[in-house]
């Protein structure tokens, strides 16, 4: 299709080389009411059109994102091409950061419901570069987090080394809705919900003599509970001795409760005791088996191949550990009678 | 809060259940205890059942009681009671840590089971 | 598995005055040991957990101390309201093991 009649946006995305970051692009199709330009290169002035301006962006659900090639081949459809760019409703999704990302991206409707609408497009070209000046060390991360019942702030990461008074007019998305009430590079939380966690986006406008283009930047927000006071808490096992039989196999679970930690460096492990003699043993990895916002329970078994006479004289140690202290629960093995 | 149902008089050797029902608290965060209080005599612990439902009983207690629950209650089933079982029996939100140290609070008010032929 | 025994059995103290209740841990518990109260009819009641520290809502005239081995619970300005039987258990908990309560001692106020 012909993309000349296509709206024409211009982002930049700066992104820094030292953290994960994503970014996205929405189809800004007109709304109804402003949806004028779609048909600005069809229509005069004076023809009015017979129906209603393009709807599509009723259920931007129903978009085509496409990419220019910049060597002049034809359009690519976005998801078999792009693997690291994922298409969400009406926004693309980019996964990873990088100057490859920069180019020209273009949606449309799917459903094409009347000629006018051929031209009802956006065409956004993206440039992508990796931050270069060192003067704004501590800018905002692209990850923040907000304290559950507290007041917290979210700021927009581009803008986050400027004072207030010289920061420009912002515009802040919320999971891709436009938040329309902030306008500043900041926004200031008076009592942190769970509702408040998302993606925020934020835009301002940046202009040379020659034009002007958007920048954005891309915020995680999540909502945390504040780190846990307690050791962790072994779930399992409870009994201290375990009724086994000899020379069968033989699989023991450790689980434990372990509270959330912003940096959360969990130890579970097994050791044995023998005598006056303990080591550690290599077992599975630990696998996390449920995670809520205040808690992870935290899986690891120990594996016998055959339970021998030897083991019954044994300690078997889970030992579990956060930065607040540790626990153990250990398992003597007895043999089953009968 | 917690409160403890079902108790009353049975004769020896028939299943009783008792019931302990929570409320203001989520049994998927706490462990539950029962506990006894036989007349006149001290607290003598039972056993537990934890958030992913493990179970522990003391020693005397293995094989005549079962510690079970649901969305909001916990049951402790007596499976054969003699006359040695007639005791108040309390249930407890616990063990669960304060200051890193297990500890039993709320307690309910208990409920009375007596063992009689 | 850890024995916890309470000492004396019944103490009688009139009113305003103190009392001194003792538990001893058959082996070490560090401070993991916390001090219930029973009224005649009523259940268990937290009051210190931690050899020393209060539970939520509790009179500071209930003192909790002691560690390794030794507890002791004082109760000073005794009102008539803290005539209970008091228990001792042992809050050191790995996941198993007993919870051993104390024997419990009756406080009576005269």
């Known amino acids: 299709f012909n993309i000349s009649g296509c709206s024409t946006k211009k982002l930049l995305w700066t992104y820094s080389t030292r953290s994960e970051e994503e970014f996205v692009l929405f189809c800004d199709l007109p709304e109804p009411q402003k949806s004028h330009f779609c048909h600005r290169n069809r229509l005069s002035p004076k023809q009015v059109p017979e129906h209603l301006p393009f709807m599509g962006s009723n259920d931007l659900s129903d978009v085509q994102w496409y990419q220019q090639p910049s060597n002049g081949d034809p359009l690519e459809d976005i998801r078999k091409s792009y693997p690291h760019i994922i298409q969400d409703k009406c926004t693309l999704h980019f996964l990873t950061p990088g100057v490859n990302n920069s180019g020209s991206y273009i949606c449309r409707p799917k459903m094409i419901k009347s000629p006018y609408d051929v031209a009802c497009c956006v065409k956004m070209i993206l440039e992508v570069k990796p931050q270069t000046n060192a003067s704004c060390e501590y800018s905002a991360s692209h990850k923040q987090d907000l304290l559950l019942g507290s007041t917290g702030s979210i700021s927009c990461p581009s803008l986050s080394c400027q004072s207030d008074a010289q920061s420009p007019a912002v515009t802040w998305y919320k999971n891709g809705k436009l938040l329309s009430v902030e306008r500043s590079n900041r926004i200031v939380v008076d009592e942190v919900y769970d509702y408040h966690q998302g993606t925020y986006v934020c835009d301002y406008t940046q202009s040379d003599t020659v034009s002007s283009w958007t920048v954005r930047a891309v915020v995680q927000v999540r909502t945390i509970v504040g780190d846990t006071k307690l050791k962790p808490d072994i779930l399992d096992p409870v009994e201290d001795t375990l009724e086994v039989e000899l020379g069968k196999p033989l699989t023991i679970s450790c689980k434990a409760r372990f509270g959330f930690e912003r940096v959360f460096n969990p130890v579970i492990k097994w050791y044995i005791k023998d005598s006056d003699l303990e080591w550690e043993v290599s077992v599975p990895e630990a696998k996390s088996i449920k995670s809520t916002l205040k808690d992870e329970i935290i899986e690891r078994n120990i594996i016998l191949e055959k339970v021998t006479q030897r083991d019954l004289r044994r300690k078997f140690v889970c030992f579990v550990q956060n930065s607040i202290g540790n626990t153990t629960q250990s398992v003597q093995l007895k043999e089953k009678r009968g | 809060s917690v409160e403890e149902s079902g108790g009353r008089l049975v004769a020896p050797g028939t299943p009783l259940t008792l019931t302990c029902t929570v409320s203001?608290?989520?049994?998927?965060?706490?462990?539950m205890s029962w506990v006894r209080q036989a007349p006149g005599k001290g607290l003598e612990y039972i056993g537990f059942?934890?958030?992913?439902?493990s179970t522990y009983y003391t020693n005397w207690a293995k094989g005549r009681f079962t510690i079970s629950k649901t969305s909001t209650t916990v049951d402790l089933k007596m499976t054969s009671p003699t006359t040695e079982d007639t005791a108040t029996y309390f249930c407890?939100?616990?063990?669960?840590?304060?200051?890193?140290?297990?500890?039993?609070?709320?307690w309910g008010p208990g409920t009375l089971v007596t063992v009689s032929s | 598995d850890v024995v916890m025994t309470q000492t004396p059995a019944s103490v009688s103290a009139a009113v305003g005055g103190t009392v001194t209740i003792k538990c001893q841990a058959s082996?070490?518990?560090?401070?993991?040991l916390a001090w219930y109260q029973q009224k005649p009819g009523q259940s268990p009641k937290l009051l210190i957990y931690?050899?020393?520290n209060l539970a939520s809502g509790v009179s500071s005239r209930f003192k909790g101390s002691g560690s390794g081995t030794e507890y002791t619970l004082t109760i000073s300005d005794l009102e008539c309201a803290d005539a209970a039987t008091y228990y001792c258990?042992?809050?050191?908990?790995?996941?198993?093991?007993?919870?051993?309560f104390g024997g419990g001692t009756e406080v009576v106020v005269k």
């Open positions: 082996q070490s518990i560090g401070s993991s």
């Open positions: 059942i934890n958030i992913i439902d």
């Open positions: 931690s050899a020393s």
């Open positions: 407890a939100r616990g063990p669960y840590y304060v200051n890193n140290e297990n500890v039993f609070d709320p």
């Open positions: 258990q042992c809050t050191y908990y790995g996941g198993s093991g007993d919870v051993p």
């Open positions: 203001g608290f989520s049994l998927s965060n706490y462990a």
